[in-house]
Amino acid sequence: EAGLPRAGGGSQPPFRTFSASDWGLTHLVVHEQTGEVYVGAVNRIYKLSGNLTLLRAHVTGPVEDNEKCYPPPSVQSCPHGLGSTDNVNKLLLLDYAANRLLACGSASQGICQFLRLDDLFKLGEPHHRKEHYLSSVQEAGSMAGVLIAGPPGQGQAKLFVGTPIDGKSEYFPTLSSRRLMANEEDADMFGFVYQDEFVSSQLKIPSDTLSKFPAFDIYYVYSFRSEQFVYYLTLQLDTQLTSPDAAGEHFFTSKIVRLCVDDPKFYSYVEFPIGCEQAGVEYRLVQDAYLSRPGRALAHQLGLAEDEDVLFTVFAQGQKNRVKPPKESALCLFTLRAIKEKIKERIQSCYRGEGKLSLPWLLNKELGCINSPLQIDDDFCGQDFNQPLGGTVTIEGTPLFVDKDDGLTAVAAYDYRGRTVVFAGTRSGRIRKILVDLSNPGGRPALAYESVVAQEGSPILRDLVLSPNHQYLYAMTEKQVTRVPVESCVQYTSCELCLGSRDPHCGWCVLHSICSRRDACERADEPQRFAADLLQCVQL
């Protein structure tokens, strides 16, 4: 089953770890109040303490199943032979308002379980209606969801969920908005937020698209809410570059997708190509992203307020090999303000009757934009025309850091005392710690100041999550969760080494002659008691 916490990390003090030797790990979430860690895996859901001791394990598989059985065998007898089938956890979300965990798997056409947070007791497993089947695709890192709580004391919670469908467009929408009921056994659970004969809260990949491009699918890498919008970062087959000939080379494009939270008919659907470029090299394969707030310094440099959202992203080079992308990759920065502005400009242009809707995978014809006098502001959520809308120009991010050797796979970020720290997981199992400062001398917008091993030789998976107190970073590989301290100031034994490290967390604590955080140093606010700048070392 699951191993005990054990030592890790090279010359660092041992990191706390949780090992799961039998079952591959897929997803990780951290409870923002308790700090407890929930881990999704193949056939298991784990609950761990903040220091990674195992508190509970819940078995989700294997189950007797066959991917061809629709509906699943638990609902209707199936002519296909059943076999022991792994249940891969594909979505793991905390529903704070209902004190439950939503865990969606690959088995039984992609049904979800609701587990009580305290003890992982199964509260419900809706599985008898077609709306309960999200997708039978087994790939763990291809589905993303955002849970939207209902207005306090009233209103419905809902789940926005995106998933690949493996050609089964008659069974599964690629993107949908579902009702989340308080009672797990409620018949309306996972029902579409809106549905009539013509429109509903879902997008299906049209059968014509799949006829022409049988490999066409959309892979959902990251999703988040910002203001009144839900966004997805996706990878999809590029139908402009890929030949319909199945034997031809496949090219992929990264898209940012946006919907209004309160748009049950999906009239606000917009997608734009997204990527970044550095020294003539295009980085177009999105690997991970992380929504954050800029530190005071970065906000000032970007001309943003400190409470505005920014998006840190990792892109691999080029447009080929989605599953095994090139090692060369880039950490890039987008501001939501710029993304919103680009989208608004495109909508405004379309409502002036300029151009076409430009969404070939979704529309079976090149619909022209309709001229209309409507005022399009930042909050515009669409009409029943000029939708769905595709961007024709790539939204380009600011490249911060390029890794040519290891390959960046995951990203997280936070603001430490006004400075922006980014953590990037790599293909070799390392965590790179990066200080983002657009005013760096020499014009380098980011400085990689430390690299630590989480698990040697195993790629860091996407769910790189900070503990609620921002003291630790939880990094996950297929077999292990590692708790990495955000700083290891104590490893630096002199003032010069301490401040020469450029770790923004670290300063020289004069009273104890140790390198530490400011808040760990007695009388740090008194003059000459805490050195935060290399020049101060000489003075001390």
């Epitope: 004969e197 013509f198 429109v199 014809k365 022209g368 001229n371 029943d384 025309f385």
Partner: antibody, heavy 119, light 108 residues
């Protein structure tokens, strides 16, 4: 059953105004728009405009801009169409229709209201 | 302003296939709808989004749209299909919905 029930026939003098009502039932009124279409005797259909019952946005046919006003009352699930400065060529059957969307057409129609403009 | 042109009348024998055309500039770049109107009655939507049938509309009604022409096809035409048929699309420059002039279908 989804229904649109329109007000009764009207006879008006040239230069006057007419206001036709359309009461919806059997569906969530604010989930759809209402289009207004007219048909002069022995003639074809002419689209007059559309109003969103969700947010009140309107789009009027260019030919009628300035003479037509469409409104809704969500509390009674009723749509209204007012046409001003009536002329004899405004004599027609006026239909309200549930607007399913630009791409989907008008899927439920009222029975029509005959408006006669005559001096 | 955008115009849709339909033949004033089409005749067909019972059981045969009737085709009613609707032409307009680059109509294939828009979605076309078709309405049936019997004498003294309100119009009924029979085809939307070029090819789709609303619930309750018989399978013998089908639609297509490409280039400059949309076509409503009624296979195995019945006497009850005798009616006026209107196509409808939109004017991209004004957002107006536009109807064709209508076609009277006579089942001989």
């Amino acid at each position: 059953e989804v229904q649109l029930v329109q007000s009764g026939a009207e006879v008006k003098k040239p230069g006057a105004s007419v206001k036709v009502s359309c009461k919806a039932s059997g569906y969530t009124f604010t989930s759809y728009g209402i289009s207004w279409v007219r048909q002069a005797p022995g003639q074809g259909l002419e689209w007059m405009g559309w109003i969103s019952a969700y947010n009140g946005n309107t789009n009027y046919a260019q030919k009628l801009q300035g003479r037509v006003t469409m409104t809704t009352d969500t509390s009674t699930s009723t749509a209204y169409m007012e046409l001003r400065s009536l002329r004899s060529d405004d004599t027609a059957v006026y239909y309200c229709a549930r607007h399913a969307g630009y791409y989907y057409g008008m899927d439920v129609w009222g029975k029509g209201t005959m408006v006669t403009v005559s001096s | 302003s955008y115009e849709l042109t339909q033949p004033p009348s089409v005749s067909v024998s019972p059981g045969q296939t009737a085709s009613i055309t609707c032409s307009g500039d680059k109509l294939g770049d828009k979605y076309a709808c078709w309405y049936q109107q019997k004498p003294g009655q309100s119009p009924v939507l029979v085809i939307y989004q070029d090819t789709k049938r609303p619930s309750g509309i018989p399978e013998r009604f089908s639609g297509s749209n490409s280039g400059n022409t949309a076509t409503l096809t009624i296979s195995g035409t019945q006497a009850m299909d005798e009616a006026d048929y209107y196509c409808q699309a939109w004017d991209s420059s004004t957002a107006d919905r536009v109807f064709g002039g209508g076609t009277k279908l006579t089942v001989l």
